[in-house]
């Protein structure tokens, strides 16, 4: 069947070999069955990405505890639900603890390092700089357009996009979601932020969907720089020597 594909994740292999000939899709790199009606978890997406590589003033000040993803790509360990395992290690037995977004939140150690829990990232601050425009975007229009985007494209419940700040040419999008607020079917802010980040970079994860084309009253929003800050429910545990900015 040519229509056996995963609309929300192009990094999958799909077939109709399952019970009753139902279309089933598995994430590349992990072979985990994914739900194609919603976003795939960031952990499985990162794992798929790594497997593919192997084969071929109104603005918010980020909190002092906010962390940037300085380490970039790695091949993560995911649990049976596709979430990041608390402890991640590389091939040379260097290990570290991560948050629910998969970003390192401790110093690196050896295999004796203990990570008791996956600390939830409950606040994500996405900071964008847009390309030149002859007129600044209307804040209200920009706010509406970005809220529509997160709700319609990423299926994020509107209550989890807490604010859109704008001070030309910088846009900040605040996503907030406590563990107690997230329902079973709710998209995780970590996954919505990752899909958005990939869209902004022109690397859409959606199958066959045209790239991101955000327009505010007819003016296209061209993003030329992105920074994403992650704030966890518990402060990160870095030693004092790690005081360099991301």
């Amino acid at each position: 069947q040519s229509n056996c594909t995963c609309p929300t994740n192009k990094m999958t292999v799909c077939d109709t070999n399952g019970p009753g000939g139902v279309c089933q899709c598995r994430a590349m790199g992990s072979q985990v069955l994914v739900d194609c009606s919603t976003l795939t978890s960031k952990c499985l997406l990162l794992k798929a990405r790594m497997s593919a590589r192997k084969s071929g003033r109104s603005l918010v000040m980020p909190s002092e505890h906010a962390i940037l993803d300085n380490d970039g790509l790695y091949d993560p360990e995911c649990d049976d639900k596709g979430r990041f395992k608390a402890r991640q290690c590389n091939q040379t037995s260097v290990c570290w603890c991560v948050n629910s977004v998969g970003v390192r939140r401790t110093d690196k150690g050896d295999q004796s390092l203990r990570c008791d829990e996956v600390v939830r990232t409950h606040h994500i601050l996405i900071e964008l700089r847009h390309r030149p425009t002859d007129r600044a975007f209307n804040h209200s229009d920009l706010d509406s357009e970005l809220r529509r985007l997160f709700q319609e494209r990423y299926k994020l419940h509107p209550s989890f996009l807490s604010a859109v700040h704008y001070e030309e040419p910088t846009i900040q999008i605040e996503l907030r979601q406590n563990a107690s607020q997230k329902g079973l079917r709710d998209v995780d802010i970590a996954d919505a932020a990752y899909y958005f980040e990939r869209d902004i970079k022109g690397e859409s994860l959606f199958m066959g969907r045209r790239g991101l084309d955000v327009q505010v009253r007819g003016e296209p929003l061209h993003v030329e720089r992105t920074l994403i800050y992650y704030l966890d429910e518990k402060p990160p545990q870095f030693s004092m020597k790690r005081l360099t900015a991301g």
């Epitope: 700089r129 847009h130 390309r131 030149p132 425009t133 002859d134 007129r135 030309e168 040419p169 084309d213 009253r217 007819g218 003016e219 296209p220 929003l221 061209h222």
Partner: antibody, heavy 123, light 109 residues
Framework: AVTLDESGGGLQTPGGALSLVCKGS????????MGWVRQAPGKGLEYVAA???????GYGAAVKGRATISKDTGQSTVRLQLNNLRAEDTATYYC?????????????????WGHGTEVIVSS | ALALTQPSSVSANPGETVEITCSGG????????YGWYQQKAPGSAPVTVI????KRPSNIPSRFSGSTSGSTNTLTITGVQADDEAVYYC?????????FGAGTTLTVL
Amino acid sequence: AVTLDESGGGLQTPGGALSLVCKGSGFTFSSYAMGWVRQAPGKGLEYVAAISSGSSTGYGAAVKGRATISKDTGQSTVRLQLNNLRAEDTATYYCAKSGYGGSASYVSDIDAWGHGTEVIVSS
Amino acid sequence: ALALTQPSSVSANPGETVEITCSGGGDYYGTYYYGWYQQKAPGSAPVTVIYDNTKRPSNIPSRFSGSTSGSTNTLTITGVQADDEAVYYCGSYDSSAGIFGAGTTLTVL
């Protein structure tokens, strides 16, 4: 392939009006800023006017107050109207396409040019 | 009004690397934007070799590159060829209007 075809040039009389049209093809016309750049004989390039995808406009100092730039997205055309023509408006006029849509002012974004249409203002 | 500054002429032997600088463009919240346009003969249509500081159209050879340091942009032609002989104009922005430099004539010896 992106193509930009200018028309409307030729011999014009001082004090008269000029209307140049550029038709674009091979790209989504509505998504990009478009503009006009001219070159007088023996001189360098000069920004004339541009219009963003959202229809905001910009004009060069030499034509401000005399020029109007507009577009017809349905026809994929951009038009330059230049009134009160002077001898110094004599030049080859090039249609230019921006690689982006948001600004009419950044000639740093031009990624494609037309072949040009020659305008001579003389009595 | 701002004025873009670029050298009036540069020359090089085939195979050498040529750098042409352009400065004086307006900034958009601390970032400067430049483009480079090649014109082989007066009255012939310009060709974009670099736009948006570093981007190269798909039809332009990889020997052309652009880089920005502060408010200055540099067009670099690595391994210059006889066919690269032309006038190179830089373009930027000045308070709601585009501006061009006076042009740099590249002579390939």
